[in-house]
């Protein structure tokens, strides 16, 4: 069914400042993936750090921190000619507006490191 | 400050399924980071694909697809003894409940690939 022509897009300036959100989360078969051990097997391995904030939804977010500055080579040694770097993503979370009652939230952007990747460094040649 | 004793918890049966969410996003400055070129410089490079859905907030999400099955070695060739794999993250988005007007949303979980990393393959030894 088509949307009302008068309904603004969520990205528009005229979009309503407050909207009603159902906390019955739709789960689009998200859990069909197997949990990965990539954090251990990667050439740019990472550790996962627990970030808990009870005034946020979701309350618990696990964040990646690269284990090395360099990357792990075929011999299992760290090669400093390459760099381990975090892959970051901006996510939306809900922040409770007041600690008194949890019915009101505000959208908040959070930058989280999801894992690490191995990159060729940018070489700055001196003049 | 403590929460009101009378405030039910979001996971409880008596919690209102609908909450009020302000779309005045906190932490807009998250975007101040420079976009990285890791997708090109990585030993497990990826391309970014635009996923647009007008009934979702945010409407546009960029998803990563690994360019190769293997990883790029120091000579710039693809080494198939290693694997490029996507690093996935579960994110929250808002899904319009009704196509008529955008005041009602439902939280939805989405699994997105944020980038790729190079891993040592799991070798299955035959009996």
């Amino acid at each position: 069914m088509p949307r009302n022509p008068g309904c603004p897009n969520a990205e528009d300036k005229n979009f309503p400042q407050n909207v009603k959100v159902s906390l019955n989360i739709l789960n689009k078969s998200v859990n069909s993936r197997r949990p990965s051990d990539y954090y251990n097997r990667s050439t740019s391995p990472w550790t996962l750090h627990r970030n808990e904030d009870r005034e946020r939804y979701p309350s618990v977010i696990w964040e990646a921190k690269c284990r090395h500055l360099g990357c792990v080579n075929a011999e299992g040694n760290v090669d400093h000619h390459m760099n381990s770097v975090p892959i970051q993503q901006e996510i939306l979370v809900l922040r409770r507006e007041s600690q008194h009652c949890p019915h009101s939230f505000r959208l908040e952007k959070m930058l989280v490191a999801v894992g690490c990747t191995c990159v060729t460094p940018i070489i700055h040649h001196m003049a | 400050m403590p929460r009101n004793p009378g405030c039910p918890n979001a996971e409880d049966k008596n919690f209102p399924q609908n909450v009020k969410v302000s779309l005045n996003i906190l932490n807009k400055s998250v975007n101040s980071r420079r976009p990285s070129d890791y997708y090109n410089r990585s030993t497990s490079p990826w391309t970014l694909h635009r996923n647009e859905d007008r009934e979702r907030y945010p409407s546009v999400i960029w998803e990563a697809k690994c360019r190769h099955l293997g990883c790029v070695n120091a000579e710039g060739n693809v080494d198939h003894h290693m694997n490029s794999v996507p690093i996935q993250q579960e994110i929250l988005v808002l899904r319009r409940e009704s196509q008529h007007c955008p005041h009602s949303f439902r939280l939805e979980k989405m699994l997105v690939a944020v980038g790729c990393t190079c891993v040592t393959p799991i070798i299955h030894h035959m009996a």
């Epitope: 996962l48 979701p58 309350s59 | 929460r3 009101n4 579960e90």
Partner: antibody, heavy 121, light 107 residues
């Protein structure tokens, strides 16, 4: 119905290891972390650590000095707690409990029935 | 680690009595307190979370309060099924620590 079902009682020798399982059912396994808590005979509760079955993330009580390993198998919705270099003071009931990642006000709402581990020479 | 000290460590009371158990944190950098009830041979059961809020299915005679370093669990009118051991747990500073327990016995 949410259930956490733990493996049976174990008797172990000092210096050996024990691995306790906790099979979850009735909910989406990856929406919750699994925390482990132990209770020595006649004593209080002691938090050991947490595992996130989704990311594989773990966080431990440093008191256990690297002796604890927490893992999970999403395909069977089972979490595991392995304790190595066992000593007599590790004799206790070991519990698993789920902890919501979405709203941690809802933490530790369901518990396993407990697994008794006896360390004796 | 933050130490949680419960008092009293044991308590005798009668059915119908009003009972108060307190929990004091060794420092004030905790966010919330959860309270658990445990009966012999059973797993703990969550009663109160986030200092004040009653867990699902818990009778309204149980209530929680407090802030800073001092927290309280109150049972307004003891029932026979309430005789058990009660534990507080601090949330917000790792490792999350439990109090040593308060054993509530029939007088």
């Amino acid at each position: 119905e949410v259930q956490l079902v733990q493996s049976g009682a174990e008797v172990k020798k000092p210096g050996s290891s024990v691995k306790v399982s906790c099979k979850a059912s009735g909910y989406t396994f990856t929406d919750y972390e699994i925390h482990w808590v132990r209770q020595a005979p006649g004593q209080g509760l002691e938090w050991m650590g947490v595992n996130d079955p989704e990311s594989g993330g773990t966080f431990y009580n440093q008191k256990f000095d690297g002796r604890v390993t927490l893992t999970a198998d999403e395909s069977t919705s089972t979490a595991y707690m392995e304790l190595s270099s066992l000593r007599s003071e590790d004799t206790a009931v070991y519990y698993c409990t789920r902890y919501s990642k979405w709203d941690s006000f809802d933490g530790m709402d369901y518990w396993g029935q407990g697994t008794t581990v006896t360390v004796s020479s | 680690d933050i130490q949680m000290t419960q008092s009293p460590s044991s308590l005798s009371a009668s059915v119908g009595d009003r009972v108060t158990i307190t929990c004091r944190a060794s420092s004030g950098i905790i966010s919330y307190i959860d309270w658990f009830q445990q009966k012999p041979g059973k797993a703990p059961k969550r009663l109160i979370y986030a200092t004040f809020d009653l867990a699902s299915g818990v009778p309204s005679r149980f209530s929680g309060s407090g802030s800073g370093t001092d927290y309280t669990l109150t049972i307004s009118s003891l029932q026979p099924e309430d005789f058990a051991t009660y534990y507080c747990r601090q949330v917000g500073s790792y490792p999350e620590t439990f109090g040593q327990g308060t054993k509530l016995e029939i007088k």
